[in-house]
Interface confidence: medium
């Protein structure tokens, strides 16, 4: 069954989850008693076309409601779990009262007031962020939307819209809240290897362990297919078949200028003479291409103590 929720003493209007594009009449029942819900508007809870209206809602209205669409050859039944909550005492809106999160980016963005199209509402819609009324000119309420100019991370938070539903000469309040998060516009660039340097030679001691880091940056945010890896003599380390040489999987890092970078470390447990004749390639690749920095190992010259 689908779920809907509302707040005590506010209007709540829900639709039959089975309705699709059906034009056939819809009947509503209290699921537990099978008692039919009337269509007369003088009742606090009544049916109007495919909609069930709670004007206003009470906590005791919570429960499962059944709707039946009667067509000549088939009856379709839908179930709706309705929960009416007491108004939260503080400004912290619990998760169960939140509608889907809106993700914003770029210069302008809009937040839509959830469920508003079910109601007979009139402009303007009032908007609040973390319970404070929005009065800056950057925030513009238009129809069922809130437009935010020059969005920044500071605009993240819980946005509540409040509007009035008019029925039979009476006005009812409706409020709905959703979170707004700002996604930073990322950029992708051709990989840049920051370590090791191009055509680098590294000094090692025979019999001692050695480790070489391959680090590369790929831009900021939204990277696809970004990888750093080592190859030995043009063969990936896992296939090289030398247990002494292992690759430690890429770590995510952030560089000083806030770019997204990856590091993979090549570890040799005990360097042998044979290792000095191998070619070690640090590879960085993403969607756009690949760059290779080749390094060689050289025996460390003993320090002359004469």
């Amino acid at each position: 069954s689908k779920s809907s929720w509302g707040l005590e003493n506010e209007a709540l209007i829900v639709r039959c989850p089975q309705r699709g594009r059906s034009t056939y009449p819809v009947e509503w029942y209290y699921s537990d008693t099978n008692e039919s819900i009337p269509t007369q508007k003088r009742n606090r809870i009544f049916v109007s076309r495919d909609r069930l209206k709670f004007l206003p809602a009470r906590v005791e209205d919570s429960g499962i409601y059944a709707c039946v669409i009667r067509s000549p050859n088939l009856n379709k039944t839908g179930y709706l779990n309705v929960t009416i909550h007491k108004k939260p005492p503080s400004c912290n809106i619990p998760d169960y009262l939140m509608y889907s999160t809106v993700r914003g980016s770029d210069k302008n963005f809009k937040i839509t007031c959830p469920t508003i199209d079910l109601y007979n509402w009139t402009a303007p819609v009032q908007w609040f962020k973390n319970c404070k009324a929005l009065q800056e000119p950057r925030f513009r309420a238009h129809r069922s939307y809130l437009f935010i100019d020059n969005v920044t991370h500071d605009d993240e938070g819980d946005y509540t819209c409040q509007f009035t539903h008019a029925e039979n000469g009476t006005n009812y309040i409706v409020t709905a809240t959703r979170s707004f998060t700002v996604e930073e516009k990322g950029f992708s660039m051709f990989p840049v290897i920051t370590n090791p340097p191009y055509n680098h030679t590294m000094e090692v001691e025979i019999g001692k362990p050695a480790s070489i880091a391959c680090s590369a940056c790929f831009g900021k945010g939204s990277h696809f297919l970004a990888d750093v890896l080592w190859q030995i003599n043009k063969t990936v380390v896992g296939n090289f078949g030398e247990a002494r040489i292992q690759e430690e999987e890429g770590r995510n890092e952030s560089s000083s200028n806030d770019m997204d970078c990856l590091t993979s470390v090549l570890r040799i447990t005990g360097v042998t003479e044979k290792d000095l004749s191998l070619e070690y390639d640090c590879l960085a690749l993403n969607l756009h291409g690949m760059i290779r920095h080749t390094i060689r190992l050289r025996r460390k010259q003993p320090i002359d103590h004469r």
Epitope: M189, F224, L287, H288
Partner: antibody, heavy 128, light 113 residues
Framework: QVQLVQSGAEVKKPGSSVKVSCKAS????????MHWVRQAPGQGLEWVGV????????TYAQTFQGRVTITADESTSTAYMELSSLRSEDTAVYYC?????????????????????WGQGTTVTVSS | DIVMTQSPDSLAVSLGERATINCKSS????????????LAWYQQKPGQPPKLLIY???TRESGVPDRFSGSGSGTDFTLTISSLQAEDVAVYYC?????????FGQGTKVEIK
């Protein structure tokens, strides 16, 4: 010569999974991206996803996110594309295609472009 | 997603005549890091996989006849067949490789008039 050979046609029931293989030969498997593209009957080309066989990283089209898994077995130079929770609209020819690479010697850059070698295609039919 | 739009949907050209197919991307596919347009053209004949003709918008793939040429930059691209041959009857697709998801145009069917 460079070749991609795909597994044979499959007939599947809705809700089941299919795993298509693509065996590469004639080049170093780990040096090139491998894409998967599908084509429904009488329709255009739709990109499914891509893998870097060397590093193992993958990226999928949003449409298939959560239903598709692309893997690569370096030891056999074979790429795989597995699609789960099949529905009738997944009926299509599935192609593997190698990502082209242009080498620039000045900086050891390898620029990726298009899809230069394609498999023969695997027909997947989803029908109850 | 970058949307690729080809025009026309189909094209009938006499043998030996020029055929021109246009492709427009919803945003630029020119990658500033290497000043290359990440755009490719493919030819697909019935019952066959697509075949790469052009990459970087204007570089001909090896083995492709020189009657095929690509041009354009940024968002507007053109594939030209300078002198249509019988074997060129196919569907042609443009494709951007600039960002994920990789996207193709809807295809242009080239026939002989």
């Amino acid at each position: 010569q460079v070749q991609l050979v795909q597994s044979g046609a499959e007939v599947k029931k809705p809700g089941s999974s299919v795993k298509v293989s693509c065996k590469a030969s004639g080049y170093t498997f780990t040096d090139y991206q491998m894409h998967w593209v599908r084509q429904a009957p009488g329709q255009g080309l739709e990109w499914v996803g891509v893998i870097n066989p060397g590093g193992g990283s993958t990226t999928y089209a949003q449409t298939f996110q959560g239903r598709v898994t692309i893997t690569a077995d370096e030891s056999t130079s074979t790429a795989y594309m597995e699609l789960s929770s099949l529905r009738s609209e997944d009926t299509a020819v599935y192609y593997c295609a190698r990502g082209g690479v242009e080498y620039s010697s000045s900086w050891d850059y390898y620029y990726y472009y298009g899809m230069d070698v394609w498999g023969q295609g695997t027909t997947v039919t989803v029908s109850s | 997603d970058i949307v690729m739009t080809q025009s026309p949907d189909s094209l009938a050209v006499s043998l030996g005549e020029r055929a021109t197919i246009n492709c427009k991307s919803s945003q630029s596919v020119l990658y500033r890091s290497n000043n290359k347009n990440y755009l490719a053209w493919y030819q697909q004949k019935p019952g066959q996989p697509p075949k790469l003709l052009i990459y970087w918008a204007s570089t001909r793939e090896s083995g492709v006849p020189d009657r095929f040429s690509g041009s354009g930059s940024g968002t507007d691209f053109t594939l030209t067949i300078s002198s249509l041959q019988a074997e060129d009857v196919a569907v042609y697709y443009c494709q951007q490789y600039y960002s994920i998801p990789v996207t193709f145009g809807q295809g242009t069917k080239v026939e002989i008039k």
